[in-house]
Interface confidence: medium
Amino acid sequence: FKVATLYSLYVCPEGQNVTLTCRVFGPVDKGHDVTFYKTWYRSSRGEVQTCSERRPIRNLTFQDLHLHHGGHQAANTSHDLAQRHGLESASDHHGNFSITMRNLTLLDSGLYCCLVVEIRHHHSEHRVHGAMELQVQTGKDAPSSCVAYPSSSQESENITAA
């Protein structure tokens, strides 16, 4: 399987909400022996590998923000810890996997990584990640709502979080 980032850059005004999204695609084994662990973290663009270093998002580690389920099942973080920090990660039946950040501040700007680990019990773990940039802007140059720039083309799209 692979992970695709729908957008490589999100530009948002301060105070807005944004949902960063990754999609898992390709063959997904739905057997009892296979589960998926999905999470988010902040990182930096390393010289060797992007998303190598795992930094917290608003003081929450990748362990705090994880989802764990079998196949393309729906799941979301319901624990108070994430919600107290204005965060919620979710996964749907179609392989979409997202994190919603509420009330953005300039400190939220940076590189965000989604991580998916396919766990085949008694055999192996296969892990892949996707990366995207979030720029939070303030002042007259800031957009009125979030603008997302697709990974594969230059056309932008206005988005708002639920």
Epitope: T35, S52, Q63, L115, V117, H121, E125, R127
Partner: antibody, heavy 118, light 106 residues
């Protein structure tokens, strides 16, 4: 504060069985796997196996199948390892350690010393 | 199973000296992890994903490598670094550790 508190040292007779406990606190128990590691003078560190409190799934090092049985009690956030038919080769320090998938064992218990002797 | 061979088995270094130890895997692994253990204590995570420092680990520690060859470096040896260091792989079951490198202070 993340803590893994293991049960105390054990002196057991050959052929007997015993159970070590590992009580977790300070984190979401079901968000990690609980791993068990054996440390003896002969073999240094050996991974015994893991259990996922999320779904009770286990994975064992083939070498320890039939020797170790891993279980969890989610209600008390406690992991257990039962060691069966003990021999002198099972004398060692046993550690529990938590691990998030795709990561490493970032917190370890203090270790439980097991001595098998008649 | 993947066998991890660490070398040297024992080494000593003076304070301020640069220290490098290696871990060789019998088959290619995606990432390497390093742990430090002092006598009477539990292992402590030092390096994850080959080159990233775990929380609270001093910047004098670094990791590198790929495929079957990995290394752990201490840029300037300090007395508190005297310990045994283990490499470990999570790429395939059963997960395995190296036999350890014991680092002593001169």
């Amino acid at each position: 504060e993340v803590q893994l508190q293991q049960s105390g040292p054990e002196l057991v007779k050959p052929g007997a069985s015993m159970k070590i406990s590992c009580k977790a606190s300070g984190f979401s128990f079901t968000g990690y796997t609980m791993n068990w590691v054996k440390q003896s003078h002969v073999k240094n560190l050996e991974w015994i196996g893991l259990i996922s409190p999320y779904n009770g799934g286990t994975s064992y090092n083939q070498k320890f199948k039939g020797k170790a049985t891993l279980t969890v009690d989610k209600s008390s956030s406690t992991a257990y390892m039962e060691l069966l038919s003990l021999t002198s080769e099972d004398s060692a320090v046993y550690y529990c350690a938590r691990r998030a998938y795709g990561y490493a064992m970032d917190y370890w218990g203090q270790g439980t010393s097991v001595t098998v002797s008649s | 199973q993947i066998v991890l061979t660490q070398s040297p088995a024992i080494m000593s270094a003076s304070p301020g000296e640069k220290v490098t130890m290696t871990c060789s895997a019998s088959s290619s692994v995606s990432y390497m992890y390093w742990y430090q253990q002092k006598p009477g204590s539990s292992p402590r995570l030092l390096i994850y994903d080959t080159s990233n420092l775990a929380s609270g680990v001093p910047l004098r520690f670094s990791g590198s490598g790929s495929g079957t060859s990995y290394s752990l470096t201490i840029s300037r040896m300090e007395a508190e670094d005297a310990a045994t260091y283990y490499c470990q792989q999570w790429s395939s079951y059963p997960f395995t550790f190296g036999s350890g490198t014991k680092l002593e202070i001169k």
